[in-house]
């Protein structure tokens, strides 16, 4: 059994979250990947996803979220720029693998965004948008919609939940009432 774990990032408004999700490249290099938020009592909500099939090193931008999938390294880079307090929450990377349930990649990210400016003289924290210049050739991909056979009345698994794991990803087959992905044609 595998423990779902969380990693906390404490950031200020206007700053950027920059995380990397590690996956098994032989199995999932071209698979579609997504960035989701998990709110208590709700199904995970997909905020952004790569194209299908996922393109190597091709930035996908959805609002303030930028995804870049590096097939050669087995890495999905996720950036959330110009963070707002309302962005606080629990996030995860998943890999779509229809018709099977998606894989969730370690670790979940507990993002805490607070108001205020924590800059120091000489730092360029106030130039987040300059540091993160979004490439002009970004693409907005269509993400699979999540559906559920019944209303979710409980929160998704907490960080102590046990689920099975193949290789280096968590297989969510044991929580099918929480996550559903339609089969692609």
């Amino acid at each position: 059994a595998t423990k779902l774990t969380e990693e906390k990032y404490e950031l200020k408004e206007g700053q950027t979250l920059d995380v990397k999700c590690d996956y098994t490249l032989e199995k999932f290099a071209s698979s579609q990947k997504a960035w989701q938020i998990i709110r208590d009592g709700e199904m995970p909500k997909t905020l952004a996803c790569t194209e299908r099939p996922s393109k190597n090193s091709h930035p996908v931008q959805v609002g303030r979220i930028i995804l870049e999938d590096y097939h050669d390294h087995g890495l999905l880079r996720v950036r959330m720029v110009n963070l707002q307090v309302e962005d606080s929450g629990l996030y995860q990377c998943v890999i779509y693998q229809p018709p099977k349930e998606p894989h969730m990649l370690f670790d979940r990210i507990r993002l805490v965004v607070t108001k205020g400016f924590s800059g120091t003289p000489g730092s360029n924290e106030n130039s987040t948008q300059n540091v993160y210049k979004i490439p002009p050739t970004t693409t907005k991909a269509l993400c699979p919609l999540y559906t559920s056979p019944r209303t979710v009345t409980q929160a998704p698994p907490k960080s102590t939940a046990d689920v099975s794991t193949p290789d280096s990803e968590i297989n969510l087959t044991n929580v099918t009432d929480i996550i559903r992905v339609p089969v692609f044609n």
Epitope: D18, C21, H73, G74, R77, F106, D107, S118, S168
Partner: antibody
Framework: EVQVLESGGGLVQPGGSLRLSCAAS????????MSWVRQAPGKGLEWVST????????YYADSVKGRFTISRDNSKNTLDLQMNSLRAADTAVYYC????????????WGQGTLVTVSS | EIVMTQSPATLSVSPGERATLSCRAS??????LAWYQQKPGQAPRLLIY???TRATGIPDRFSGSGSGTEFTLTISSLQSEDFAVYYC??????????FGQGTKVEIK
Amino acid sequence: EVQVLESGGGLVQPGGSLRLSCAASGFTFNAYAMSWVRQAPGKGLEWVSTISGSGSTTYYADSVKGRFTISRDNSKNTLDLQMNSLRAADTAVYYCAKVAGSNFFFDHWGQGTLVTVSS
Amino acid sequence: EIVMTQSPATLSVSPGERATLSCRASQSINSNLAWYQQKPGQAPRLLIYGAYTRATGIPDRFSGSGSGTEFTLTISSLQSEDFAVYYCQEFIMWPPYTFGQGTKVEIK
């Protein structure tokens, strides 16, 4: 509790070989990349090698490329570093380190094992 | 390869005083920076990651700031157990991951 424990260090002659091992516990081993970081006596930290959670991706510092091989056995929760063609400059304490799940920093370190390359 | 430069090499501070350590990257690493503490004969210990976030169990007298190329580790009120060597490390993407040469914080 996350624990990593290195073994296999010792004295070896230049040109010789040595295999370091790291036993890990307290976390889902196959879900995390692992690394080796070394520290020469009285010097700073130097990243040596990293392997992804599945073992499918490996990285090496230029100073050890072609001489060192990193590997892992996820069924045994062990990490290895095979060191060949050793040089005096490889003398250092070698640390096994768990890579964080969200980025490439090192959130847990072993106590290190000393490798001395000398004739 | 990104070069990380720490300053000063040695910082002499009295207990209870504030210590400010600097780390500079040769190119922008955004917020992809970690700070470690190492005491003699011990392994390094993670203090700060993502430039600002304290690792589990790290006292709040330790704080990190900066982004891009300039970073700071601040120890607001030095305790006896804080005298050690501190290293910064970048992790912008894949390896090589480079460390600064370290700053030794010693008792004044």
